[in-house]
Amino acid sequence: AGVFELQIHSFGPGPGPGAPRSPCSARLPCRLFFRVCLKPGLSEEAAESPCALGAALSARGPVYTEQPGAPAPDLPLPDGLLQVPFRDAWPGTFSFIIETWREELGDQIGGPAWSLLARVAGRRRLAAGGPWARDIQRAGAWELRFSYRARCEPPAVGTACTRLCRPRSAPSRCGPGLRPCAPLEDECEAPLVCRAGCSPEHGFCEQPGECRCLEGWTGPLCTVPVSTSSCLSPRGPSSATTGCLVPGPGPCDGNPCANGGSCSETPRSFECTCPRGFYGLRCEVSGVTCADGPCFNGGLCVGGADPDSAYICHCPPGFQGSNCEKRVDRCSLQPCRNGGLCLDLGHALRCRCRAGFAGPRCEHDLDDCAGRACANGGTCVEGGGAHRCSCALGFGGRDCRERADPCAARPCAHGGRCYAHFSGLVCACAPGYMGARCEFPVHPDGASALPAAPPGLRPGDPQRYL
């Protein structure tokens, strides 16, 4: 268990032409708040799919009123971190969605109005317990700068928050090979039984039965030194058998384009098509410097002393990508059948099967629902040999692939106003009512049970929505 923490540094116009209009005006002052949605893995999921790792909502920022004629500045931000607690192991790879919402504070009938200003998304690799990672994302003409980290909650420790701390058995020191559990100096790491034969000098484990190699070593038991002297070229993907680096066949081998850029060969070399927010020959320039710590998984950052010069991450064995964020992908052969999720554990590949399938490669069909995929968080319901999809709020149709208006069923009681939200819906309640769907009459203490708005309550206070 642990907590993912997100710190928003700034939200404002991005560089370049076409600066956005200020979202607030003298007639309609407004304030911002942010929502973060986390999902495990690196899958390209729809924004509407559940935030399986969790979600969090910020407080609202200070009220902002545009100065007439002035360009939109960085907008005032809410105080504090956004915290997303996770109960189980930290997955290491995750997808995020960060939304910037605007609350208009004019005299709307029925309370404040909200609108989505910007949504950014990305996929990252992150070890728990590491330093803050900084990031810049652009959405249209807006730019969002933020930092994030994952930390374990005691007694969990380790990069996945799976190792546990235990009280010391001896008062003076921990047992052989066991370290004190910082910051709980009076406790020791509980011993782990690694994979049988795993090199005690060059291997380690964070889960029982695992054998992960220190830099410079490879092989299932971390007993094979990585050698580059007999290799032909320092370019190309790592060979799992020899530990050598083998040459690639063309200029786009290994995709020289950083930050998700796509590579196309040209008569003389290659050309990168960069995603929004990145530029340069290899899409390597993003305004982030080595001082921001952009290299993951122990990667070494070189260059990039100022935002206009590129940084390069030199990755340790087993990782690749412009920020060393990608593990060398042995799952690309798609060994898992029936939509199973492939997990590269270092020493082995494992398939995590979808509901209704089993077996080492998810090859066994278990039940009626097995061949039936319900999209967008829908669940398959069996019954008498037949099956159907019970769709999540906001979706409909036979396989839950059709967008439905979650507000169409008028879920907000007592005149509450409904707003669609990417993970459900929110109700802004009429004065005198409360609850997720405005189903409760407000009862002031020491008064009758007639609905009444308590002093200072703004109906549908969006600071609460999570």
């Epitope: 907590v3 559940p50 935030c51 969090a56 909502l57 407080a59 915290q83 607690p85 909650e153 669940t379 319901v381 019970s390 999540a392 709020l393 906001g394 979650p406 069923a409 879920p411 009681a413 939200h421 993970s423 459900g424 819906l425 929110v426 109700c427 409360m434 609850g435 997720a436 769907r437 189903e439 409760f440 009459p441 407000v442 009862h443 203490d445 308590p454 200072g456 309550l457 703004r458 206070d461 600071q463 609460r464 929505y465 999570l466």
Partner: antibody
Framework: QVQLVQSGAEVKKPGASVKVSCKAS????????IHWVRQAPGQGLEWMGI????????SYAQKFQGRVTMTRDTSTSTVYMELSSLRSEDTAVYYC????????????????WGQGTMVTVSS | EIVLTQSPGTLSLSPGERATLSCRAS??????LAWYQQKPGQAPRLLIY???SRATGIPDRFSGSGSGTDFTLTISRLEPEDFAVYYC?????????FGQGTKLEIK
């Protein structure tokens, strides 16, 4: 770790009042409603009321109106439930439980519960 | 208020068998129905919300179905740890109400 931690067991005399606390940690306190549910020995679950930690507004089950008061302290992320004019049939385990504010998600129902506080009313 | 009636009151089954628990509402609860599991001396634990969506960390042997007034909780293959009391709860309208519970015991 997301949790709700409740105060310890209480023994009260008929006619007295009891105040049970529920401290939230691991989530944004003002982003979830807190409900109170009680369970008499060997019986089922009975909903008592709801409080919104953000604005402090609350709503009570009709059965408890006039006897129950729910309050919150945002500085300590704690919600309180006070029940007055106690009688023997109020002997029960009192639970707090959280509910999210976006309809259609897990938090739509009571996804996290406190460990319960046993209140015994006896002369 | 919406009255929820669970049946049967007690269900005696063996591990490995399939369990089907019913919850009937006196008026429509739409799909705002949850199922909880409670073991002696413990707080209830959320299994199903929205009538058919599994809560985080709940094994896929648990499934819920129904809408309106008739709801079902199905446990496809009973494990020893599944023997407990199960409650349905409607959160469609105030006041929220619970069923009286179904005790699932080992045969």
């Amino acid at each position: 770790q997301v949790q709700l931690v409740q105060s310890g067991a209480e023994v009260k005399k008929p006619g007295a009042s009891v105040k049970v606390s529920c401290k939230a940690s691991g989530h944004i306190f003002i982003s979830y409603y807190i409900h109170w549910v009680r369970q008499a020995p060997g019986q089922g679950l009975e909903w008592m009321g709801i409080i919104d930690p953000s604005g402090g507004s609350k709503s009570y089950a009709q059965k408890f109106q006039g006897r129950v008061t729910m309050t919150r302290d945002t500085s300590t992320s704690t919600v309180y439930m006070e029940l007055s004019s106690l009688r023997s049939e109020d002997t029960a385990v009192y639970y707090c439980a959280r509910q999210g504010m976006i309809v259609g998600t897990t938090g739509d129902a009571f996804d996290i519960w406190g460990q319960g506080t046993m209140v015994t009313v006896s002369s | 208020e919406i009255v929820l009636t669970q049946s049967p009151g007690t269900l005696s089954l063996s591990p490995g068998e399939r369990a089907t628990l019913s919850c009937r509402a006196s008026q429509s609860a739409s799909s705002y129905l949850a199922w909880y599991q409670q073991k002696p001396g413990q707080a209830p634990r959320l299994l199903i919300y929205g009538a058919s969506s599994r809560a985080t960390g709940i094994p896929d042997r648990f499934s819920g179905s129904g809408s309106g007034t008739d709801f079902t909780l199905t446990i496809s293959r009973l494990e020893p740890e599944d023997f407990a009391v199960y409650y349905c709860q409607q959160y469609n309208s105030s006041p929220y109400t619970f069923g009286q519970g179904t005790k699932l015991e080992i045969k």
